[in-house]
Interface confidence: medium
Amino acid sequence: KLTIESTPFNVAEGKEVLLLVHNLPQHLFGYSWYKGERVDGNRQIIGYVIGTQQATPGPAYSGREIIYPNASLLIQNIIQNDTGFYTLHVIKSDLVNEEATGQFRVYPELPKPSISSNNSKPVEDKDAVAFTCEPETQDATYLWWVNNQSLPVSPRLQLSNGNRTLTLFNVTRNDTASYKCETQNPVSARRSDSVILNVLYGPDAPTISPLNTSYRSGENLNLSCHAASNPPAQYSWFVNGTFQQSTQELFIPNITVNNSGSYTCQAHNSDTGLNRTTVTTITVYAEPPKPFITSNNSNPVEDEDAVALTCEPEIQNTTYLWWVNNQSLPVSPRLQLSNDNRTLTLLSVTRNDVGPYECGIQNELSVDHSDPVILNVLYGPDDPTISPSYTYYRPGVNLSLSCHAASNPPAQYSWLIDGNIQQHTQELFISNITEKNSGLYTCQANNSASGHSRTTVKTITVSAELPKPSISSNNSKPVEDKDAVAFTCEPEAQNTTYLWWVNGQSLPVSPRLQLSNGNRTLTLFNVTRNDARAYVCGIQNSVSANRSDPVTLDVLYGPDTPIISPPDSSYLSGANLNLSCHSASNPSPQYSWRINGIPQQHTQVLFIAKITPNNNGTYACFVSNLATGRNNSIVKSITVSASGTSPGLSAGA
């Protein structure tokens, strides 16, 4: 199919464009170009007859068009009016016509833009500034750049007038930046020179430095004032309301107590017309004053807050000292002193950090102490404790539960039964309970200051029958002659008798056996291997009784001194040596052998075939119990004689 391609499609004024013909048919008579989307004799640009190779200009010919034998049309020195459609009319030898249309667009080469502003010296927080990108150009796109970045998103920035105008509402000092605009169309892009926005601001509240306000007689007072301001501020100093001088710094040498008073720095901005002042009170001491402690946090929360205690006043060239609980500061990673020792910071306070804290100022003769300061550390609540610890009750008794959780300020308590709120008290009392009062009893402790809550849940069972008890142990694998074991009969029940049996017998009398906690706990001191028995606890009341399953105590012991068998120590040459080692131990020990000090194998049995006199020597068996951490050994001497030299020798194994 006959097609026209415009190269380029977007053409700059003054440049040229080629209307390139694709798929031109064979056997042509000629062709003709027209301006527009159809064949119109009045708008013919040029015609071409192939046979004569003759090009004939038409009414629309401008003298800038060149036609090529392949039917392509070059238009030079493009003007704005050239924009639009172009139609090629092809006449074949058989006089059948074919048409194709192409198009291009003409854009001007853009000039370098510039920025105009409606306000060259806007005042912060008061004025708006409108930047306009010049000139106004048709079919151009306008872009803005701030510090060579695209525009940030801000409700104070507004584009209007087809993005040609950038308005900054309520300018701030942060709007002081380099602004550029850019114009773009399909054939060119140009960027303006920078415009620097000069925002007038301030003065802010001046800062007087240094910050210390306490001085000793004889020192020099050198105060400096600074206020952020554009243009820079003009400064004036007043002492006790009386004007002193118009300088940024105030210097008074060799001050006396009479120089105490209020020192005011006034900053003035002549462009904004604004004044700001800051006052500092200077105290000149004849001698060091009594120090006092200030805190940045009067109610710190445990494990969350840090507290900075500062020793006041700040005095140059002074040594500051600190005491906690009437002792000098302990070494702790949570205690930090500032470089001048004036500020003591407690990182992540705990309830133990309450103090008291004292600071001191050292002078030539003595140390002046501050009054003690106590921290009010907010903590908790910790996990509440519900008492008594009974979990089983008989019907008909009164249930009285008390809840307590360490907390500052004291916790507020709530009780829930099976998830339902009951009352907001520390104690819960239910008279004449029945089985229906069985359930989950939750105490909730809340600290109103920290906003933290903690809960403890207790299962209460009301039943005439006692449950089957169970035994808990504080040590499942005690070591002989070293550990004690405490067995506790669970659960704890009210008005209940606790009983114990060992191997089905009642408890033997022994100074190593001790009952406590209302016979609920049985303690075995210095356990021995003979204590490895079956222990049963029982509970009983006037209605029922029940026994636990037996718990067998697994006592770790040994290894005892090993025994090597057979006991023979003399062997004939040629016999087999088969030594076995055994040691009483729980768990079973690990065995190893050494012959004449040289390690052999890690087995219980040592076997050597056809021994000779070379096998004479010391045979040592070593035993170790990894669980008890204990070791033991025994040494046996073996003598091997040449065959037949001495009667009565063993023939070996």
């Epitope: 099976d418 998830g419 029945t434 089985e435 229906k436 069985s438 989950l440 299962t459 449950p467």
Partner: antibody, heavy 124, light 110 residues
Framework: QVQLQESGPGLVRPSQTLSLTCTAS????????MHWVRQPPGRGLEWIGW????????EYAPKFQGRVTMLVDTSKNTFSLRLSSVTAADTAVYYC?????????????????WGQGSLVTVSS | DIQMTQSPSSLSASVGDRVTITCRAS??????????MHWYQQTPGKAPKLLIY???NLQSGVPSRFSGSGSGTDYTFTISSLQPEDIATYYC????????FGQGTKLQIT
Amino acid sequence: QVQLQESGPGLVRPSQTLSLTCTASGFNIKDYYMHWVRQPPGRGLEWIGWIDPENGDTEYAPKFQGRVTMLVDTSKNTFSLRLSSVTAADTAVYYCNTRGLSTMITTRWFFDVWGQGSLVTVSS
Amino acid sequence: DIQMTQSPSSLSASVGDRVTITCRASKSVSASGYSYMHWYQQTPGKAPKLLIYLASNLQSGVPSRFSGSGSGTDYTFTISSLQPEDIATYYCQHSRELPTFGQGTKLQIT
């Protein structure tokens, strides 16, 4: 012998109130929390609520709140369920039950005694 | 509400097989040493029957091939050797707060 038996109409019209009664025998209902559980056809079990016959205290599942009422008649050792504004979705087998008559246990919501169930169909 | 997720929703096994059903709670149903999870068996047309209470305790009269275990949020119900009479739907139920049941597991014999 400990038993629970549900009774009531098997057919209820939409928007009407479903009423069922559970009669206990072999024990005194005042000593236990009494519950209702239902099971729509081919579906799982849904707990409706409990009543404490001793004082009339009740607690209902949030799903049924506002539509359900449980009442007790300790003189007859019975308790009842009323479910208002019923729709076809309330068609189910309704069971009364209670906890821990045969087992010493430690929570009120635990069911080892059940009625045989009563099928209630909601249809016009 | 604590949500119960029971799996699988159905399963087939042969006589003598070991069968395991699990139930997961959306938050812990354990408190003060107890796990408030119970298991029921329901055969067609009958009321549910309590098998296991407080996670692992066998209800009186229930065969010892049924067992339960678990704590916190995850619980398991096991039939050690499946018998023909065990064809039923099994439900878990918690009683840590207002009770809710699992959606059930339908057990069939292949």
